[in-house]
C-alpha cells in the first residue's frame, strides 16, 4: 500500500530539524525509545508527539533559547515551528487521543529526533516496498 503523505511530511520535517543543531536541541526530553519493546506503533507515535508537545510548551518562552538578538529569536521560533508541525503530524498518524509518558530516562532533543527519524525511515521503507 502507498505510504501516508503525513509520513512523508514527518520525514521531511525531521530531515530539516536534524540538518543542524542549536542551543536548545541540546536540552533533554523524556526518552520514550529506551524501553519501547511492548509498545504499539501508534502508541510510539502518540508518545513521541506528547514528548515534543511537553518540550515546546516548556521551552517556547525559555530565555536561554530565545537568546539576546533578533537572529537568535528567529532561530528559536524556527525550532518551535518545526516541532509543532511534527507534533501535529505525529498525532495524525497515531490516531489516539492521549497516551502516558512515564519513562525516567532522558535524551537530548537532538538524539530523540535522530532516533525518531530512523524509526520513520524504517516505516517508510516498509510501506514503499
Amino acid at each position: 500500500h502507498k505510504c501516508d503523505i503525513t509520513l512523508q511530511e514527518i520525514i521531511k520535517t525531521l530531515n530539516s530539524l536534524t540538518e543542524q543543531k542549536t542551543l536548545c536541541t541540546e536540552l533533554t526530553v523524556t526518552d520514550i525509545f529506551a524501553a519501547s519493546k511492548n509498545t504499539t506503533e501508534k502508541e510510539t507515535f502518540c508518545r513521541a508527539a506528547t514528548v515534543l508537545r511537553q518540550f515546546y510548551s516548556h521551552h517556547e518562552k525559555d530565555t536561554r533559547c530565545l537568546g539576546a538578538t533578533a537572529q537568535q529569536f528567529h532561530r528559536h521560533k524556527q525550532l518551535i515551528r518545526f516541532l509543532k508541525r511534527l507534533d501535529r503530524n505525529l498525532w495524525g498518524l497515531a490516531g489516539l487521543n492521549s497516551c502516558p509518558v512515564k519513562e525516567a530516562n532522558q535524551s537530548t532533543l537532538e538524539n530523540f529526533l535522530e532516533r525518531l527519524k530512523t524509526i520513520m525511515r524504517e516505516k517508510y521503507s516498509k510501506c514503499s516496498s
Epitope: 530539516s16 543542524q20 543543531k21 542549536t22 538578538t69 537572529q71 525550532l79
Partner: antibody, heavy 118, light 107 residues
Framework: EVQLVESGGGLVQPGGSLRLSCAAS????????MHWVRQAPGKGLEWVVW????????TYADDFKGRFTFSLDNSKNTAYLQMNSLRAEDTAVYYC???????????WGQGTLVTVSS | EIVLTQSPATLSLSPGERATLSCKAS??????AAWYQQKPGQAPRLLIY???HRYTGIPARFSGSGSGTDFTLTISSLEPEDFAVYYC?????????FGQGTKVEIK
C-alpha cells in the same frame, strides 16, 4: 535536490536599475530564510540582506537600505532583489543563498554578475 | 556592526600539513560563528556552523573551535582540494558580517 538559480544580471549605467531573480527548488520555500550576498571582483564576501520567507520581512545591511528592495513571490518559489540608483562600486557577483534551518547559509546559487559602468 | 578580522591573510602550506585559521570579532558573538570555503569561480560552501559543528558531508579533517570573540578553523591534514579561500561569518546579529578571508595556497 536543493537548487538556487539566479538571473537578471548584466551591464547597467550608473544611476540605473536592475532586478535580480533567485528561483528556488527542491525544498519548501517558506521553511527557510533567503539571503543575498555579493562579491566585488577580487574581493571578499559582503552580506546584503536576508528575508524571513514566512513573514516576508527583510533585514538589510545599512549600506543597502533605501536603494535595494528584497521581495518574494511564494507562488513561484522566487526571491527578487530590486536594485536602484546603482553605482560603479555595486559591480559584483550577486549570490542568493538559503539560510540554514538555524545557522549560516547552506545552499548557494551560482551567482549573477552585475556590472555598473558607463 | 560587528567587524570580523581574519589572520593570516595568506597561508602557504604543503599537502598533509595542518592549517590553523583565526577569526577575531570586534565584540562577542557567543557561539554564532560559521566558516565557508570558496574556490575560484565557485560559490562559497558552508563548512562549519555554530562555532564547531560540521555541516552535512563536510570531512572530519575540518574542525572549528572558540567562543566569544576568538574563533579558529583547523584543517588537520591538507588535501589538494582544500587549497582555497576561507571566510568566517557571524550570524549573532544583523547585519551578518564576513571576515576578509584567508587564502590557503600551496607552498
Amino acid at each position: 535536490e536543493v537548487q538556487l538559480v539566479e538571473s537578471g544580471g548584466g551591464l547597467v549605467q550608473p544611476g540605473g536599475s536592475l532586478r535580480l531573480s533567485c528561483a528556488a527548488s527542491g525544498y519548501t520555500f517558506t521553511d527557510y530564510s533567503m539571503h543575498w550576498v555579493r562579491q566585488a571582483p577580487g574581493k571578499g564576501l559582503e552580506w546584503v540582506v536576508w528575508i524571513n520567507t514566512e513573514t516576508g520581512e527583510p533585514t538589510y545591511a545599512d549600506d543597502f537600505k533605501g536603494r535595494f528592495t528584497f521581495s518574494l513571490d511564494n507562488s513561484k518559489n522566487t526571491a527578487y532583489l530590486q536594485m536602484n540608483s546603482l553605482r560603479a562600486e555595486d559591480t559584483a557577483v550577486y549570490y542568493c543563498a538559503r539560510g540554514g534551518i538555524f545557522y549560516g547559509m547552506d545552499y548557494w546559487g551560482q551567482g549573477t554578475l552585475v556590472t555598473v559602468s558607463s | 556592526e560587528i567587524v570580523l578580522t581574519q589572520s593570516p591573510a595568506t597561508l602557504s602550506l604543503s599537502p598533509g600539513e595542518r592549517a590553523t585559521l583565526s577569526c577575531k570579532a570586534s565584540q562577542s558573538v557567543i557561539n554564532d560563528a560559521a566558516w565557508y570555503q570558496q574556490k575560484p569561480g565557485q560559490a562559497p560552501r558552508l563548512l562549519i556552523y555554530y562555532t564547531s559543528h560540521r555541516y552535512t558531508g563536510i570531512p572530519a579533517r575540518f574542525s572549528g573551535s572558540g567562543s566569544g570573540t576568538d574563533f579558529t578553523l583547523t584543517i588537520s591534514s591538507l588535501e589538494p582540494e582544500d587549497f582555497a579561500v576561507y571566510y568566517c561569518q557571524q550570524d549573532y546579529t544583523s547585519p551578518w558580517t564576513f571576515g576578509q578571508g584567508t587564502k590557503v595556497e600551496i607552498k
